[in-house]
């Protein structure tokens, strides 16, 4: 059965954009005029996992690359990485559980948690041109707020 | 709070083709999957197939080749047909439903139907 | 085809903890449930999304799920427990569910 997706952009609460930032990772910087069309656009699709009110659980593909956002341990740390898939099986209701992030409202803001470790958020830098990561602090001088914005398919 | 009530034809002769069908009652039928599973006697549980409202199906590949699985939204009712039944067909058929709030998994099961296959 | 194993058997004492595994390849990365299927009724969910509760299942249920491994523990386990148990999860386009584990409660 068909998976529910939607294109969308991503900025941190602080309104940078993300890029990518060579073949398998994204950076966030502020953009202006021109320089918007860099943002990466997402294919968000609403996938298997624990759903509520605020919270639904998505995965975050790159639209029209066979990229998705997945968390993994790296050197016994939960890390943010960009996996490749096989398109001709991705996006799928049910996901692997690295793919499946929880999309938490809050205020008006979103924050994405890991469903494969919990209390970890898609993170970015208060500094400019950095990479996004997954972070295991809220609320710290780690941003993980971020406002969502739709594209048109 | 929701029922599930299932009915269908109990005893069949090989090559005959199973057929059972699924009433839902309370609860929206459009925000769920619809599933089948069977159980032979004294064994364990087997997924035969799902469908959501719109028609979408998966299907068990074991199977695929004789099972169709369609939804009646009119009535809140789904159907199973499995053609070309032989003895190893012979189980008790559940249908349940897969609901978002449990992760998509099986929170509502019918009574079950025990369905026969000897000639 | 996606295979999940548990033990047929698993004997445990009143008010002990029982604990059944379900295994498979990779299954820490995927979601697993757990069933509860008396004699001659429906299954009943008592573990979603790997450790979850549905409301009206008892506390002294929960689960975990790293690794290849998967499992259903039971603390202070009653003889209203004495079940089969079912593990399922999710094997790319259709569920697959483990053998089932028959739970005995002595005495």
């Known amino acids: 059965a068909p998976v529910r997706s939607l294109n969308c952009t991503l900025r941190d609460s602080q309104q940078k954009s993300l890029v990518m930032s060579g073949p398998y990772e994204l950076k966030a910087l502020h953009l202006q005029g021109q320089d918007m069309e860099q943002q990466v656009v997402f294919s968000m699709s609403f996938v298997q996992g624990e759903e509520s009110n605020d919270k639904i659980p998505v995965a975050l593909g790159l639209k029209e690359k066979n990229l998705y956002l997945s968390c993994v341990l790296k050197d016994d740390k939960p890390t943010l990485q960009l996996e490749s898939v096989d398109p001709k099986n991705y996006p799928k209701k049910k996901m692997e559980k690295r793919f499946v992030f929880n999309k938490i409202e809050i205020n008006n803001k979103l924050e994405f948690e890991s469903a494969q470790f919990p209390n970890w958020y898609i993170s970015t830098s208060q500094a400019e041109n950095m990479p996004v990561f997954l972070g295991g602090t809220k609320g710290g001088q780690d941003i993980t707020d971020f406002t969502m914005q739709f594209v048109s398919s | 709070q929701v029922q599930l009530q299932q009915w269908g034809a109990g005893l069949l002769k090989p090559s005959e083709t199973l057929s059972l069908t699924c009433a839902v009652y309370?609860?929206?039928?459009?925000?769920?999957?619809w599933s089948w599973i069977r159980q032979p006697p004294g064994k364990g549980l087997e997924w035969i197939g799902e469908?959501?409202?719109?028609?979408?199906?998966n299907y068990n590949p074991s199977l695929k080749s004789r099972v169709t699985i369609s939804v009646d939204t009119s009535r809140n009712q789904f159907s199973l047909s499995l053609s070309s039944v032989t003895a190893a067909d012979t189980a008790v058929y559940y249908c349940?439903?897969?609901?978002?709030?449990?992760?998509?998994?099986?929170?509502?099961w019918g009574q079950g139907t025990l369905v026969t296959v000897s000639s | 085809q996606s295979v999940l194993t548990q033990p047929p058997s698993v004997s445990v004492s009143p008010g002990q903890t029982a604990s059944i595994t379900c295994s498979g390849d990779?299954?820490?990365?995927?979601?697993a449930f757990w069933y509860q299927q008396k004699p001659g009724q429906s299954p009943v969910l008592v573990i979603y999304?790997?450790?979850k509760r549905p409301s009206g299942i008892p506390e002294r249920f929960s689960g975990s799920n790293s690794g290849n491994t998967a499992t259903l523990t039971i603390s202070g386990t009653q003889a209203l427990d004495e079940a089969d148990y079912y593990c399922?999860?999710?094997?790319?386009?259709?569920?697959?569910f483990g053998g089932g584990t028959k739970l005995t409660v002595l005495g």
């Open positions: 399922e999860a999710w094997a790319d386009t259709y569920e697959v």
């Open positions: 999304l790997d450790n």
């Open positions: 349940a439903r897969a609901s978002p709030s449990s992760g998509w998994t099986l929170d509502y």
């Open positions: 309370g609860g929206s039928f459009s925000d769920y999957y």
């Open positions: 469908i959501d409202h719109s028609g979408s199906t």
């Open positions: 990779k299954l820490g990365d995927k979601f």
